[in-house]
């Protein structure tokens, strides 16, 4: 009697269970009575990730230098290519399709997390004794100087945008 | 990866001062806070103070002001915390931690024993 | 100094249901849109790890059954559904001025 299911690796075809072809390899012919599934490896630009029987290997991810693409990891006849971004610039989702530039903290806030190829910048708001004054990719919140190690007194307050501003103390006329 | 390596367990006799330190790896020293934090008994955290890598300038939890004096050494990226008078109240744990809001990279910890 | 106040001192939840765990402030920790309160997890013998920072925010690497809430003075951590490994002492923080404190911590027990 036909079989109506095949063991793992196996495909059902003509009433028959057929080998699925190896990750890196395309099905040519589905085996017969007398002879095996025919399968051929994959070109250098294309890849299978699976046991399969597709009759086309699937083309290597491009990552495309004019959205700001590199390569990460190069494909193999089993795995697809990896895109990441150029320096300064990170994915717009998962699949890493395209780049965008990282995000800069404002003045008042400050870099939490440094972006990666594949995260933005993870900006956090200065706190009281804190500040930035500056626009960047880069720069944390830095605490307010403090006047008292220095012998000096606060003159001006600092801000989240600014850091305090130390004078000498008014000394006590005789 | 920012990775904060103290300084190894201490045994003191009260009176005595001692100094623990807190190296820093993978990332430009100068550019982070460092706080500390003391760990009494397992449980109540409670801040001492924070310095500025940057220019060695500091701020004290007005509770440990004279117990803790802080201080960097930038050429080998480490942070130190000199604790002064020791009592048996001053046994505890004690971390450095990295951070300006919450504290997102902490040592693992130097235990203090204080005794005679 | 700002005192925060954690409730329950420990909780005893069992395995996929939902903890929750409150820090209340003495004086409002918010201001100018952003609530400087943080969260920590910790182990016996472990240092706190960060879980959540300015309320409400997932420190990279922590699994989404974390979550914060609140504003002011009343903020709010809950784990759902509750993992044998989230057995811990979670403590609350504050960054709204110096000095900083932390809260006396919640003990967290999974049945």
């Known amino acids: 009697e036909p079989p109506t299911a095949c063991r793992e690796k196996q495909y059902l075809i003509n009433s028959q269970c057929c080998s699925l072809c190896q990750p890196g390899q395309k099905l040519v012919s589905d085996c017969t009575e007398f002879t095996e599934t025919e399968c051929l490896p994959c070109s250098e630009s294309e890849f299978l990730d699976t046991w399969n029987r597709e009759t086309r290997c699937h083309q290597h991810k491009y990552c495309d230098p004019n959205l700001g693409l590199r390569v990460q990891q190069k494909g193999t006849s089993e795995t697809d290519t990896i895109c990441t971004c150029e320096e300064g610039l990170h994915c717009t989702s998962e699949s890493c399709e395209s780049c965008v530039p990282h995000r800069s903290c404002l003045p008042g806030f400050g870099v939490k997390q440094i972006a990666t190829g594949v995260s933005d910048t993870i900006c956090e708001p200065c706190p009281v004794g804190f500040f930035s004054n500056v626009s960047s990719a880069f720069e944390k919140c830095r605490p307010w100087t403090s006047c008292e190690t220095k012998d000096l007194v606060v003159q001006q307050a600092g801000t989240n945008k600014t850091d305090v501003v130390c004078g000498p103390q008014d000394r006590q006329r005789a | 990866e920012v990775q904060l390596q103290q300084s190894g367990p201490e045994l003191v006799k009260p009176g005595a001062s001692m100094k623990i330190s807190c190296k820093a790896s993978g990332y430009s020293f100068a550019d982070y806070t460092m706080n500390w934090v003391k760990q009494s008994h397992g449980k109540k955290l409670e801040w001492i103070g924070l310095i500025n890598p940057y220019n060695g300038g500091t701020s004290y939890n007005q509770k440990f002001k004279d117990k803790a004096t802080l201080t960097v050494d930038k050429s080998s990226s480490t942070a130190y915390m000199e604790l002064l008078s020791l009592t048996t109240e001053d046994s505890a744990v004690y971390y450095c931690?990295?951070?300006?809001?919450?504290?997102?990279?902490w040592g693992q910890g130097t235990t203090l024993t204080v005794s005679g | 100094d700002i005192v925060l106040t954690q409730s329950p001192t420990s909780l005893a939840v069992f395995l996929g249901q939902r903890a929750t765990i409150s820090c209340r402030a003495s004086k409002s920790v918010s201001t100018s849109g952003y609530s400087y309160m943080h969260w920590y997890q910790q182990k016996p013998g472990q240092s706190p790890k960060p879980l959540i920072y300015?309320?409400?925010n997932l420190e990279s690497g922590v699994p989404a059954r974390f979550s914060g809430s609140g504003s002011g003075t009343d903020f709010t951590l809950n784990i759902h559904p509750v993992e044998e490994e989230d057995a811990a002492t979670y403590y609350c923080q504050h960054s709204r001025e110096l000095p900083r404190t932390f809260g006396g911590g919640t003990k967290l027990e999974i049945k």
């Open positions: 300015l309320a409400s």
């Open positions: 931690a990295e951070g300006v809001n919450n504290f997102a990279d």
